[in-house]
């Protein structure tokens, strides 16, 4: 099955690459605007220049286009711990990231939060912290992994998933509790 093309894609596909169909005259192909600029006026006729203007401060276009307006620059979200890696230019959006020893957790496609990388106290680093993934820890004996921290088996309740890992410790605690003095 041929994928359904939107009106704009249909119009563009009639013209060679780097050009678009004039919205009022489908016999004219106008040259697209370069990145960093936007469409101010369509070309008046074949072989004539498209009127492109540079994006104003606080806006950008990252690829050739025939947009009537530049796109607004993104802002890094301080409340999510984000910091600016590189500022917005006319042809590139702001790049946001995290500080050193932090990783990004994406809550959705266009929203991430910065969290501190786990240090694996009472365990060893199985996989180092990466840009989009926390450290993977392996816990020492007598400890189990909870919320990516190695927690003492003394904090393991019977109802939790830690029971298999902490089974010897739980039995010991149970034995100690059960052994009454007569």
């Amino acid at each position: 099955l041929v994928p359904h093309l939107g009106d704009r894609e249909k119009r563009d596909s009639v013209c060679p690459q780097g050009k678009y169909i004039h919205p009022q005259n489908n016999s004219i192909c106008c040259t697209k605007c370069h990145k960093g600029t936007y469409l101010y006026n369509d070309c008046p006729g074949p072989g004539q220049d498209t009127d492109c203007r540079e994006c104003e401060s606080g806006s950008f276009t990252a690829s050739e286009n025939h947009l009537r307006h530049c796109l607004s620059c993104s802002k890094c979200r301080k409340e999510m711990g984000q910091v600016e890696i590189s500022s917005c230019t006319v042809d590139r959006d702001t790049v946001c990231g995290c500080r050193k020893n932090q990783y990004r957790h994406y809550w959705s496609e266009n929203l991430f939060q910065c969290f501190n990388c786990s240090l694996c106290l009472n365990g060893t680093v199985h996989l180092s912290c990466q840009e989009k993934q926390n450290t993977v820890c392996t816990c020492h004996a007598g400890f189990f992994l909870r919320e990516n921290e190695c927690v003492s088996c003394s904090n393991c309740k019977k109802s939790l998933e830690c029971t298999k890992l902490c089974l010897p410790q739980i039995e010991n605690v149970k034995g100690t509790e059960d052994s009454g003095t007569t």
Epitope: K75, R77, K78, E79, H105, W107, Q113, F115, N134, E147
Partner: nanobody
């Protein structure tokens, strides 16, 4: 003890509106970023919106942008979600929560209020 209590859910027809509230206590509300998340039947948690302490520059998921408005009243320790142009896909349990700090899980969130959009 942190407490978050949502209200305002109910049955509404497609295209209708609802206003959810979340009464907060047990922490300094005015210092915290607050979040609305939702869970549709048989689906995972979806981040709907969040609002920083000063109420400026809230975030909206693409699925609700232009239809939902998050707001807060720091003097009343209350978070709101105004939902307009509701559709069947908005049917879910809506929870308010404190923005996580230690890791990508919610330490503090409410029991939720059910929103059902149906004719």
């Amino acid at each position: 003890e942190v407490q978050l209590l949502e209200s305002g859910g109910g049955l509404v027809q497609p295209g209708g509106s609802l206003r959810l509230s979340c009464a907060a206590s047990g922490f300094t509300f005015a210092h915290e970023t607050m979040v609305w998340v939702r869970q549709a039947p048989g689906k995972g948690l979806e981040w709907v919106s969040h609002i920083p302490p000063d109420g400026q520059d809230p975030f909206y998921a693409d699925s609700v942008k232009g239809r939902f408005t998050i707001s807060r009243d720091n003097s009343k320790n209350t978070l709101y979600l105004q939902m307009n142009s509701l559709a069947a896909e908005d049917t879910a349990v809506y929870h308010c929560a404190l923005l996580p700090k230690r890791g990508p899980w919610f330490d503090y969130w409410g029991q939720g209020t059910l929103v059902t959009v149906s004719s």
